[in-house]
């Protein structure tokens, strides 16, 4: 089990069914780290599809939160087909202070 | 328990070459990055060099880098450190550390292997 | 390569409070340099204090503590203990490379 202290929490959320669904939306994958320290001055996002790493995510600002940590969300646009067929999309997140970089893999539901 | 236990130090002469290992148990090894430290006689802490949990990324000290490569076997629960063209200031004890997984990234260090270069 | 500068040695009497500090030859000491502090106890016992400038790793003692002090990184310890008494080496993390200072020598007298 992670022995992870008070660090960062990786979330990932598949597309929305309805962009998945119809050619003229853009389905995206959203990578989204919570609780980031003011001390983590960056993340770094990799992208993974079936494996194959992916350099065409958009990583938005990072967003002050309440508790005064960070919010950083990292978007792939993902093809249609791919999605559809249960391609399976990795988020990596590292930076200086994760000695074990943090990974999240989605799919559509078989 | 996270344990690092290097091996394969000795006398080596100016010039030679010599392979160092590191055996990792008691953590998954294949998730952490994982760093060689090297500290000379009297002397204080040199970093050596660091790999990525699935060694897509070395980093290497400057003044290193060209001699030394350093790799990893995550089947084997292992991390190696190839030295070429070894000079007497290459003279130290190597240690291999590794992160902890949020903060400190020299937290766990092994007992060290003495590599003496001399003629 | 960047320098990083240490006081050679330090004391502190125990039960008081020091700071040592880490200065980088190539300006401020930033966040970005995620400073890590790791103590030597004899027969080459080394243990990993602090990283990311202000993280205890698990297992380190709530008397240490890291932070950034006029453009250096820097460990303070509050209520020093006889145990304390040991090498402390800073490093910095530049873009691609680790660079250790030099260490001070902590006597607890």
């Known amino acids: 089990a992670p022995e992870l202290l008070g660090g960062p929490s990786v979330f990932l959320f598949p597309p929305k069914p309805k962009d998945t669904l119809m050619i003229s939306r853009t389905p995206e994958v959203t990578c989204v780290v919570v609780d980031v320290s003011h001390e983590d001055p960056e993340v770094k996002f990799n992208w993974y599809v079936d494996g194959v790493e992916v350099h065409n995510a958009k990583t938005k600002p990072r967003e002050e939160q309440y508790n005064s940590t960070y919010r950083v969300v990292s978007v792939l646009t993902v093809l249609h087909q791919d999605w559809l067929n249960g391609k399976e999309y990795k988020c990596k997140v590292s930076n200086k202070a994760l000695g074990a970089p943090i990974e999240k893999t989605i799919s559509k539901a078989k | 328990e996270v344990q690092l236990v290097e091996s394969g130090g000795g006398l080596v002469q100016p010039g030679g070459s010599l392979r160092l290992s590191c055996a990792a148990s008691?953590?998954?090894?294949?998730?952490?990055?994982m760093n060689w430290v090297r500290q000379a006689p009297g002397k204080g802490l040199e970093w050596v060099g660091e790999i990525t949990p699935d060694s897509s990324t070395i980093n290497y000290a400057p003044s290193l880098k060209g001699r030394f490569t350093i790799s990893r076997d995550n089947a084997k629960n292992s991390l190696y450190l190839q030295m070429n063209s070894l000079r007497a200031e290459d003279t130290a004890v190597y240690y291999c550390?590794?992160?902890?997984?949020?903060?400190?990234?020299?937290?766990?260090w092994g007992q060290g292997t003495l590599v003496t270069v001399s003629s | 390569q960047a320098v990083v500068t240490q006081e050679p040695s330090l004391t502190v009497s125990p039960g008081g409070t020091v700071t040592l500090t880490c200065r980088s030859s190539?300006?401020?000491?930033?966040?970005?340099?995620?400073a890590n502090w790791v103590q030597e106890k004899p027969d080459h016992l080394f243990t990993g204090l602090i990283g990311?400038?202000?993280k205890r790793a698990p297992g380190t003692p709530a008397r240490f503590s890291g932070s950034l002090l006029g453009g250096k990184a820097a460990l303070t310890l509050s209520g020093a203990q006889p145990e304390d008494e040991a090498e402390y080496y800073c490093a910095l993390w530049y873009s691609n490379h680790w660079v250790f200072g030099g260490g001070t020598k902590l006597t607890v007298l």
């Open positions: 550390a590794r992160p902890y997984d949020y903060g400190a990234w020299f937290a766990s």
């Open positions: 008691g953590f998954t090894f294949s998730r952490y990055w």
């Open positions: 990311g400038t202000n």
């Open positions: 190539t300006g401020a000491v930033t966040t970005s340099n995620y």
